[in-house]
Each structure stands twice: as structure tokens, then as C-alpha cells.
């Protein structure tokens, strides 16, 4: 806490300007009117205040707005935003995308800080859903943002917002997240033609069920191995050798290099060896010829 002391004669600040950097902490506290600071917040970012001086300015705003800052002040916080705690930010009601962008700009190029995470959470909850414009903005600043959300949070993403998602935005998503996003993507891109559809849906295929992979295998999509390796193992296992060959097209040769890794390894174990031999890749580990394969899961379902 800064002690309350009278402002020395002639030092009362009439505006927020660079002369204030020469003020001691107690002088800033005594001589800068909080209401003046609030109306001229945009000037703070052009003045080389020390970290200590910024603490005083924040203290003045906290006293003026104990229930939380108004959006008109928040929008112009600039680097003073980085002096805010998550507890401070939870008091805010940020509704404007412009305000969100202005504050994200302050932390641009750096990992998401606790302040930013709290700000985004407040903003999204205030909007009720993650609309396209918000998602556009958030993924532009934080490509991994989408994958930081829980499956429950992702369920509030409307299919229309999926158009804003770029492949790199999904790099760190796990299967549970893709399970939620894939149906939304399928819905969002449903009116596109075959090749265009595949380009858009490709990044989301880690959440695709077997029947959709079978359908894609009929469309000459030539899926690359990197995408194939991210598919759900349980979705890949029921695919036949012929279906995988059609799905991968010329990329099928890459299976050999991945034969010890999931899902390829598990898929090989489910195929007849003579079917695997038709690929001519030397894949080993399939079911030997003459063996009978019982699908016990099917048997249990029938009983």
C-alpha cells in the first residue's frame, strides 16, 4: 500500500504525459487523479513508466473501480494489462471483440499467460458460445487454443465456426477433442465436392468413425501417412486391405515404414497375411492362411 501524502505544490498532473516518469511512487499516488488516468489510459503505453510506477497506476484504477474496470478503460490498458491478476480480470465484463484483440496484442507472440487465459474464459462465457469471429481471433493469436479446451467446452463450438480452423490449430488436439470436432466439421463442410471436402476435413479425421473412412476410400482421396497415423485405432481396425489401399492410394507404400507403430501395427494383426501380401510391401504379422477368425464382439452382441 502507498501512504496517502499531499501532492507537492505545482506537481498536480493535468494530463498523463512523459513528465510523470520523474515522479516518485508517492508523488504519482498523490498527484495523479484516478479519473484523469482512466480517461487517458491510451497514453500510458507510450510512456516509459517503471514497473513500480505501473503498480501505482494500477492501484489508482483499483481504488476508482473496486468492482472491476469498465470496458472503456480495459480496451486501453496496453502493457498495464500484464500487471493484472486473474482475480482482477474475473471482475471484468468484456463484450467487445476489439477489446479482446487489443489485450491479446499485448501478449502477442508469447505463450498464453494466466491473465490471457482468464480473459478469454470471461469473454467466451459472456458470449455464451465460441462464435466464428471469436475463434478466428483466438486461433490467430494462439494456434493451439482450440486444443486447450475440454471436450465439454468444445461442444459449444457451432459448426459454422469450424471454417475458421486451420490445420495447425489442431496439432495438439487429442482423440477425445477430435471426437467432438469431427462431426461439427463434417456438418460444416457437407456441401463441398469430394476433393475440396477432403482437403478441409483431413485435419479433423482423428475423430472419424470406420464408416466415414470406408466412404472416403471410395473417393480416390490419397490420404497421406501422417493423417493415417492420427486416425483412431478402433476406426482403422475394421478396414480391409483393399479399403486401406484405396484410402492411401500411392501413399500405401509408407505402411512398411510404420508397421511397428499404431494404428498400422494393430491393423496388420487383424488382416489375413495373404491379403497383406497382395500389397507387395513385405508387411508381416497378419493372420496365417487357414486360420479361422472369430469376431467375439459380434457374438456377444448377438447373445
Amino acid at each position: 500500500e502507498v501512504e496517502k501524502t499531499a501532492c507537492p505544490s505545482g506537481k498536480k498532473a493535468r494530463e498523463i504525459d512523459e513528465s510523470l516518469i520523474f515522479y516518485k511512487k508517492w508523488e504519482l499516488e498523490a498527484c495523479v487523479d484516478a479519473a484523469l488516468l482512466a480517461t487517458q489510459m491510451d497514453r500510458v503505453n507510450a510512456i516509459p513508466f517503471t514497473y513500480e510506477q505501473l503498480d501505482v497506476l494500477k492501484h489508482k484504477l483499483d481504488e476508482l473501480y473496486p468492482q472491476g474496470y469498465p470496458e472503456s478503460v480495459i480496451q486501453h490498458l496496453g502493457y498495464l494489462f500484464l500487471k493484472m491478476s486473474p482475480e482482477d480480470i474475473r471482475k471484468w465484463n468484456v463484450t467487445s471483440l476489439e477489446t479482446l484483440k487489443a489485450l491479446l496484442e499485448v501478449n502477442k507472440g508469447h505463450e498464453m499467460s494466466p491473465q490471457v487465459a482468464t480473459l478469454i474464459d470471461r469473454f467466451v462465457k459472456g458470449r455464451g458460445q465460441l462464435d466464428k469471429d471469436t475463434l478466428d481471433t483466438l486461433t490467430a493469436f494462439y494456434p493451439g487454443y482450440l486444443c486447450s479446451l475440454s471436450p465439454e467446452e468444445l461442444s459449444s463450438v457451432p459448426p459454422s465456426s469450424i471454417w475458421a480452423v486451420r490445420p495447425q490449430d489442431l496439432d495438439t488436439c487429442d482423440p477425445r477433442q477430435l471426437d467432438v470436432l469431427y462431426p461439427k466439421a463434417r456438418l460444416a463442410f457437407q456441401n463441398m465436392n469430394g476433393s475440396e471436402y477432403f482437403v478441409k476435413i483431413q485435419s479433423f479425421l482423428g475423430g472419424a468413425p470406420t464408416e466415414d473412412l470406408k466412404a472416403l476410400s471410395q473417393q480416390n482421396v490419397s490420404m497421406d501417412l501422417a493423417t493415417f497415423m492420427k486416425l483412431r485405432t478402433d476406426a482403422v481396425l475394421p478396414l480391409t486391405v483393399a479399403e486401406v489401399q484405396k484410402l492411401l492410394g500411392p501413399h500405401v507404400e509408407g505402411l512398411k515404414a510404420e508397421e511397428r507403430h499404431r494404428p498400422v501395427r494393430d491393423w496388420i494383426l487383424r488382416q489375413r497375411q495373404d491379403d497383406l501380401d497382395t500389397l507387395g510391401l513385405g508387411l508381416q504379422g497378419g493372420i496365417p492362411n487357414g486360420y479361422l477368425v472369430l469376431d467375439l464382439s459380434m457374438q456377444e452382441a448377438l447373445s
Epitope: A46, Y51, L54, D55, K83, K108
Partner: antibody, heavy 119, light 107 residues
Framework: QVQLVESGGGVVQPGRSLRLSCAAS????????MNWVRQAPGKGLEWVAV????????YYADSVKGRFTISRDNSKNTLYLQMNSLRAEDTAVYYC????????????WGQGTLVTVSS | DIQMTQSPSTLSASVGDRVTITCRAS??????LAWYQQKPGKAPKLLIY???SLESGVPSRFSGSGSGTEFTLTISNLQPDDFATFYC?????????FGQGTKVEIK
């Protein structure tokens, strides 16, 4: 007068860890941000990391993100750099330097400590 | 990150010469630019901050100018003590990037 003294440098094998320290005196340590800057032999200066006065914000160069951690103990007037998964390209003289605000330059520097990463 | 490009990388000059070093930023940094001098085996020393403000104790033969993306450091009357490497650095963002350095050597 302001004094910054680095320590903790030495020879370390690739993949290993090292912790550097910077002891500060002659100013109110808890008021200012502290930076690490490095200089590979015969090369230019490379900013590594900064930690704000109250440790509320930490920023790193892309080249060290996820491997290096900057921290401080204001009660001991000491800055630290924990360096993990060291690589040959981390070989450098490491300097600590002070800045007084987000829009302030690095006005005081230590003399540096040499870190050599070699097998 | 903001990239800083210095030119020339090496400069040969004589005592008494007027020397100019240029620094270019990949995006506008307003006037948040510093110049440092470094001698072999020593730590860098702050010369100029905010593009043109002279640090306390630095001789007035050193001057800086520029704003936005183009900046210059000028040494008006080169002295024997000035032969060193000079670096520019932006501090408009928290990743405080340096230029690659300009070595001023004796002609």
C-alpha cells in the same frame, strides 16, 4: 553502485542441466525486471529471457522455450536461469541485465559466466 | 519476433572520422531502440536509449536518431577508445531482439 555478478557456468554434456545465478546489489532488486542475454563465442548478443519485478510475467526467446526457466528470489536479491536439455548451440557467455520498465533498455549488465556444452 | 538488421557488419575508420551505423527493424518500434558498445571480453554498455537519448556519462560525440523502422548511431569524432562492436536493440516488445552487431576497427 549497481552490481550484477553471475555464477554457475561451466562445462556440461549435451542433454544435461545447469543452473545459473545472478547476485544483485546497489539497487532495489524487487522493483526491476531482470533479463538473461547470451553471446556465443565470436558471435553477437542474443536475448534469452526476462522476468518482471514481481515474477508475474516471464518471456523467452523461441530458441530456449520449453528448456530454460527464468526465476528470481527477491528476498535473496538473486536471479536464476535453469537450463535443461542443453545443446552444443547453447555454448555462450551468459549475462544478466536489468531493465526498469517494459519500455526501458538494459541499463546495467553483469560481467557474464561461460557455459560450455560439449561431450 | 521483431528482426533487427544492422549495417555495415564491419567498418574501418580512423581516429577523428565521423562514423554512421544503421539499424533497421522489421516492423515499427516507435522510438524504443537502444545502442550498446561492447569491447572484447567485456559486458555491453548502454550508450543511447529511446533512439536519441544519451545515457548518463556517455560522451556527447555519440548521437542517435530515427523512429519507426530506420535508426542510426553516429560517432562524430572517433576516438581510440571507440573501437569496439556496436549493437542496436529494440525494446518495443518483451522479446528484446538485437541487431547482429557492427565492428568498428582501425583503418
Amino acid at each position: 553502485q549497481v552490481q550484477l555478478v553471475e555464477s554457475g557456468g561451466g562445462v556440461v554434456q549435451p542433454g544435461r542441466s545447469l543452473r545459473l545465478s545472478c547476485a544483485a546489489s546497489g539497487f532495489t532488486f524487487s522493483s526491476d525486471a531482470m533479463n538473461w542475454v547470451r553471446q556465443a563465442p565470436g558471435k553477437g548478443l542474443e536475448w534469452v529471457a526476462v522476468i518482471w519485478n514481481d515474477a508475474s510475467n516471464k518471456y523467452y526467446a523461441d530458441s530456449v522455450k520449453g528448456r530454460f526457466t527464468i526465476s528470481r528470489d527477491n528476498s535473496k536479491n538473486t536471479l536464476y536461469l535453469q537450463m535443461n536439455s542443453l545443446r552444443a548451440e547453447d555454448t555462450a557467455v551468459y549475462y544478466c541485465a536489468r531493465d526498469r520498465g517494459p519500455l526501458w533498455p538494459l541499463d546495467y549488465w553483469g560481467q557474464g559466466t561461460l557455459v560450455t556444452v560439449s561431450s | 519476433d521483431i528482426q533487427m538488421t544492422q549495417s555495415p557488419s564491419t567498418l574501418s575508420a580512423s581516429v577523428g572520422d565521423r562514423v554512421t551505423i544503421t539499424c533497421r527493424a522489421s516492423q515499427s518500434i516507435s522510438r524504443w531502440l537502444a545502442w550498446y558498445q561492447q569491447k572484447p571480453g567485456k559486458a555491453p554498455k548502454l550508450l543511447i536509449y529511446k533512439a536519441s537519448s544519451l545515457e548518463s556519462g556517455v560522451p556527447s560525440r555519440f548521437s542517435g536518431s530515427g523512429s519507426g523502422t530506420e535508426f542510426t548511431l553516429t560517432i562524430s569524432n572517433l576516438q581510440p577508445d571507440d573501437f569496439a562492436t556496436f549493437y542496436c536493440q529494440q525494446y518495443n516488445s518483451y522479446s528484446r531482439t538485437f541487431g547482429q552487431g557492427t565492428k568498428v576497427e582501425i583503418k
